[in-house]
Amino acid sequence: CDLPQTHSLGNRRALILLAQMRRISPFSCLKDRHDFEFPQEEFDDKQFQKAQAISVLHEMIQQTFNLFSTKDSSAALDETLLDEFYIELDQQLNDLESCVMQEVGVIESPLMYEDSILAVRKYFQRITLYLTEKKYSSCAWEVVRAEIMRSFSLSINLQKRLKSKE
């Protein structure tokens, strides 16, 4: 499955929007940084099928969408930027869903890669728990924003590797 050229442009736009969402200086939040234990092994160049990689990417973007579409995120972040961000993520999800259909031919395919998807879900659960424990403070959101930018970058790298293997 060929992801459209607009997909990688959308990725870049999403990263830029995340960068623009910064509300405070990250240097005032150094003590709030946290290791969320990003499931790196799910994004490494292991010999998994392309369909599995697409499913993991889909889950990553879906969870990112969920995280940023809560009422707490709307209160903490710029709504105009958030709206643009949702549009980009929605497009990413559509592209990846089309790909999953082409690769596997069944919409339920993510169930075949439960362990990988569970690892991504647990990662986002840790992020949500951190935000809750920090009472959704501005520093907590800044730490999470940086974390999502980092994980999003790793997702983009995986997509690039998939493309180069075609």
Partner: antibody, heavy 120, light 111 residues
Framework: QVQLQESGTVLARPGASVKMSCKAS????????MHWVKQRPGQGLEWIGV????????TYNQKFKDKAKLTAVTSANTAYMELSSLTNEDSAVYFC?????????????WGQGTTVTVSS | DIVLTQSPASLAVSLGQRATISCRAS??????????MHWYQQKPGQTPKLLIY???NLESGVPARFSGSGSGTDFTLNIHPVEEEDAATYYC?????????FGSGTKLEIK
Amino acid sequence: QVQLQESGTVLARPGASVKMSCKASGYSFTTYWMHWVKQRPGQGLEWIGVIYPGNGDTTYNQKFKDKAKLTAVTSANTAYMELSSLTNEDSAVYFCTRNYKYDYYTMDYWGQGTTVTVSS
Amino acid sequence: DIVLTQSPASLAVSLGQRATISCRASKSVSTSGHSYMHWYQQKPGQTPKLLIYLASNLESGVPARFSGSGSGTDFTLNIHPVEEEDAATYYCQHSGELPFTFGSGTKLEIK
């Protein structure tokens, strides 16, 4: 590919000011913090401060707060550092360097350095 | 400011042997699972090059003979087996709090 091109060698008098530049290419200049680092001849490295070109936010090492001023012009993809009230202690090589890994604050790409010599 | 003390100031290691460089921080640079200590290599007349980030993560493109370890205040850079091209000065850098500081450097010579 990512490149940081710094301005050439500068010779200045004590008490004067100098402004050096760092032109970035090969990446999104506005979305990466840019650090500045000082290295005196035969000595170690000192962190001066950092600027976010996207909106001009700066954070300084207190030691350099009254010495260095960081700015950026996004239309030119260029970061600048101005050093004022120069003394012999300011004679050094100054590097601009791109922030890496977001809030880990490491530095991946470095400019070739601008040599500043302060002499009367 | 957090002071980073590197030792030794210089060392000479035979080709193929192990080089061990230590960096001690005057205060912990670890928090919530991450150790904010990084290592750079600087060859004469060149700019520093990132080798290791967050104490033990190998930067992309850096040979696997480089490894980092440690947490809290004590960190180590190991090079094994040492190769000719590893002759350089090595610096640790922390980003645990402001201001970020570097160690004074360790000069590695290959025998």
